[in-house]
């Protein structure tokens, strides 16, 4: 495929990758399920200012971001090492909450309403952001 | 590095227009929301207007809802606001600042100056 | 409309002092809650955002807090370079407020 070289209609760049804020909630594999059909993933936060960035857009909601441990160890959906990177959690977090009555601890991580992350329950509906490099090769063809 | 710079202000009659400018630099200008904020002289900050990083939403204080306009060229890294109308009441310095929810950056001001 | 009170309006200190200023909303809202610093004749400079966030080059003995509607900013020892006005400002909805400011003046 070609090297996308701008971002899709609806789609915000910043620091050479695109990023989609959703309008409504879903679930967190729901969300991870609808960026990766948009050939993304949910976000990846790597440093302070991609931090601020996503903050800018998604004011005081709650949204899902590419992080969990429902498989054990706390791991980035793009394969990010989590120990070494950057974070960003409100004191005390992550917890593995079990005390919610919904069955289970907490396996997803989303931004709080200051933007500072939290653990929560996987299946609650939240806003998601999509995120996508801009110099990753796109899926069409190439023209002939 | 993160530049803003506002240009456009002056000495102007009451009822006159006068339209601010604010150039963008060292940052994606079409990714970010954009607000104007005002200081009259000795005063403190009260907010103007606001705009999405695509244009698509506006909104005003009701202190200018009706005579001030903000618009934005992306092509031209350059945030616009056209004030019409205007009052001895409107005197102040404006800033652009970046961002909605937070002003992160802001532009050194312009001075605009209504008075017969 | 949601209101905002900053208090107090003006405040005398001395370097190594630790100063709290405070912002209470008149409403339990979801919104963004940010403090400016601004100096004679300068545009105002963001120090904290969304309430707890420093901003970037801001040094650490500022910080922020909320308890419901009331938000503070506290610098823990004051510096000669702080003497400043300090605004808090909310964004809510639509529209956005600042507080009527605190100006922070040598004792």
């Known amino acids: 495929g070609s090297e996308r070289t701008c971002c899709p209609v609806n789609w915000v760049e910043h620091e050479r990758s695109c990023y989609w804020f959703s309008r409504s909630g879903k679930a967190w594999a729901d969300a991870d399920n609808y960026c990766r059909l948009e050939d993304a993933h949910l976000v990846v936060v790597t440093s302070w200012e991609e931090q601020k960035f996503v903050q800018h857009h998604i004011g005081p909601v709650n949204t899902w971001m590419g992080l969990h441990d429902q498989n054990g160890p706390w791991k980035w959906v793009d394969g990010t090492d989590y120990e070494t990177g950057f974070k960003n959690w409100r004191p005390e977090q992550p917890d593995d909450w079990y005390g919610h009555g919904l069955g289970g601890g907490e396996d997803c991580a989303h931004f709080t309403d200051d933007g500072r992350w939290n653990d929560d329950v996987c299946q609650r509906p939240y806003r998601w952001v999509c995120e996508t490099e801009l110099d990753k090769a796109s899926q069409e063809p190439p023209l002939l | 590095q993160v530049q803003l710079v506002e240009s456009g202000g002056g000495v102007v009659q009451p009822g006159r227009s006068l339209r601010l400018s604010c150039v963008a630099s060292?940052?994606?200008?079409?990714?970010?929301?954009m607000h104007w904020v005002r200081q009259a002289p000795g005063k403190g900050l009260e907010w103007v207007t606001i705009?999405?990083?695509?244009?698509?939403?506006?909104y005003y204080a009701d202190s200018v809802k009706g005579r001030f306009t903000i618009s934005r060229d992306n092509s031209k890294n350059t945030l616009y606001l056209q004030m019409n109308s205007l009052r001895a009441e409107d005197t102040a310095v404006y800033f652009c600042?970046?961002?909605?929810?937070?002003?992160?950056?802001w532009g050194q001001g312009t001075l605009v100056t209504v008075s017969s | 409309d949601i209101q905002m009170t900053q208090s107090p309006s003006s405040l005398s200190a001395s370097v190594g002092d630790r100063v709290t200023i405070t912002c209470r909303t008149s409403?339990?809202?979801?919104?963004?809650l940010n403090w400016y610093q601004q100096k004679p004749g300068k545009a105002p400079k963001l120090q904290i955002f969304?309430?707890?966030s420093l901003e970037s080059g801001v040094p650490s003995r500022f910080s922020g807090n909320r308890s419901g509607t009331e938000f503070t900013l506290t610098i823990s020892s004051l510096q000669p370079e702080d003497f400043a006005t300090y605004y808090c400002?909310?964004?809510?909805?639509?529209?956005?407020?600042f507080g009527q400011g605190t100006r922070l003046e040598i004792k």
């Open positions: 969304a309430a707890y």
């Open positions: 409403q339990n809202s979801n919104s963004y």
């Open positions: 705009i999405s990083y695509d244009g698509s939403n506006k």
């Open positions: 600042a970046r961002g909605v929810w937070f002003g992160d950056f």
């Open positions: 060292g940052f994606t200008f079409r990714s970010y929301g």
């Open positions: 400002q909310q964004t809510y909805g639509t529209s956005i407020t």
